[in-house]
Amino acid sequence: APVPPGEDSKDVAAPHRQPLTSSERIDKQIRYILDGISALRKETCNKSNMCESSKEALAENNLNLPKMAEKDGCFQSGFNEETCLVKIITGLLEFEVYLEYLQNRFESSEEQARAVQMSTKVLIQFLQKKAKNLDAITTPDPTTNASLLTKLQAQNQWLQDMTTHLILRSFKEFLQSSLRALRQM
């Protein structure tokens, strides 16, 4: 697994650099998670042909994965910092159950899957410190999450491969959208 942000060799080589601001830390954390997702996607794509499937075909699934929409205030048109921040945090909290599902889905990248999961928890903490309106953030129900996890793990092999691919792709795209929005803040 890659070293966490702030600890890579390039950072060590610059000991006199100014400490990272909150925004820079968040930015770097997201990029770190995206690198982890890339590694996981490589293993998934090498193992199955899911990555070749068209986005239209993949859209026909029953997963309720978080997605950005105009109303969330994260787009340049109609941008709303507070609404957007709430959406990003809520979305990441909703992704946590899917990241838990990924934990037993990888052979050579098991450590990487764990790193993505743990780094996402850290990212949520960073963002919660930045948010003013924490009351607006809805935390997923643990019981619902537990039953969803059981259901996902009971799928046949083909569906599990499809689910893994969809989670990684959706999480990647959610983070990329978040990154664009956060740089507007």
Epitope: E24, K28, I30, R31, L34, D35, I37, S38, R41, K42, C45, S54, K55, E56, K67, M68, A69, C74, F75, Q76, F79, S170, E173, F174, L175, Q176, S177, L179, R180, A181, L182, R183, Q184, M185
Partner: antibody, heavy 120, light 108 residues
Framework: SVEESGGRLVTPGTPLTLTCTVS????????MTWVRQAPGKGLEWIGT??????DTWYASWVKGRFTISKTSTTVDLKITSPTTEDTATYFC?????????????????WGPGTLVTVSS | DMTQTPASVEVAVGGTVTIKCQAS??????LSWYQQKPGQRPKLLLY???TLASGVSSRFSGSGYGTEFTLTISGVQCEDAATYYC????????????FGGGTKVVVV
């Protein structure tokens, strides 16, 4: 491949729409960007239309001067009220989707460009 | 957003040329380089600061991280005469121009 069309001579203030048509890949799978280049000048990013959420981001200088819209087969760039400063070659480019790119917008396939001349 | 130097450089065939690009804030390794010949469309050379794009000659190499980046062309050939642009990979909020101003390489 990527190809732009619609470039022509227009008078200042006359709206103009440029069209980007692609083949060999699907617009439902790739973000697309518009870049322009004034005669003898450098490349200037205008904006990018993303796939997943359908959001479009523009350079900070755009301020409503351009609008990017996407259909299933084309990506359009509307110059809302052209001025002589908008005289340029307009390029449409695909934003690659390789995992190695991470969060990085890499313009991996470009059209030949279409020339827009704004003059009275 | 991106400052490129020099604006123009002359190099002899077989020589080496170095182009620098500076970002106004840290962009990690999210930087690409493009080559554009007169009257042609730009062509992707490198991405992620140092990774060669498919089909690009190994004469081209890139390095850098954070705010300082370099493109090096070793063993310059006549066909390398072109303008080279760096591009920061963040084209989201608050970006003025994703591209550097360009460096014209003249091969003598």
């Amino acid at each position: 491949s990527v190809e732009e069309s619609g470039g022509r001579l227009v008078t200042p203030g006359t709206p103009l729409t440029l069209t980007c048509t692609v083949s060999g890949f699907s617009l439902s799978s790739y973000a697309m960007t518009w870049v322009r280049q004034a005669p003898g000048k450098g490349l200037e990013w205008i904006g990018t239309s993303y796939v997943y959420s359908g959001d479009t981001w523009y350079a900070s200088w755009v301020k409503g001067r351009f609008t990017i819209s996407k259909t299933s087969t084309t990506v359009d760039l509307k110059i809302t009220s052209p001025t002589t400063e908008d005289t340029a070659t307009y390029f449409c480019a695909r934003v690659g989707d390789y995992d190695d790119y991470g969060a990085h917008d890499v313009f991996d396939s470009w059209g030949p460009g279409t020339l827009v001349t704004v003059s009275s | 957003d991106m400052t490129q130097t020099p604006a123009s450089v002359e190099v002899a065939v077989g020589g080496t040329v170095t182009i620098k690009c500076q970002a106004s804030e840290s962009i990690s390794s999210w930087l690409s380089w493009y080559q554009q010949k007169p009257g042609q469309r730009p062509k992707l050379l490198l991405y992620r600061a140092s990774t060669l794009a498919s089909g690009v000659s190994s004469r081209f190499s890139g390095s850098g991280y954070g705010t300082e980046f370099t493109l090096t062309i070793s063993g310059v050939q006549c066909e390398d005469a072109a303008t080279y642009y760096c591009q920061q990979g963040y084209t989201g909020g608050n970006v003025d121009n994703a591209f550097g101003g360009g460096t014209k390489v003249v091969v003598v």
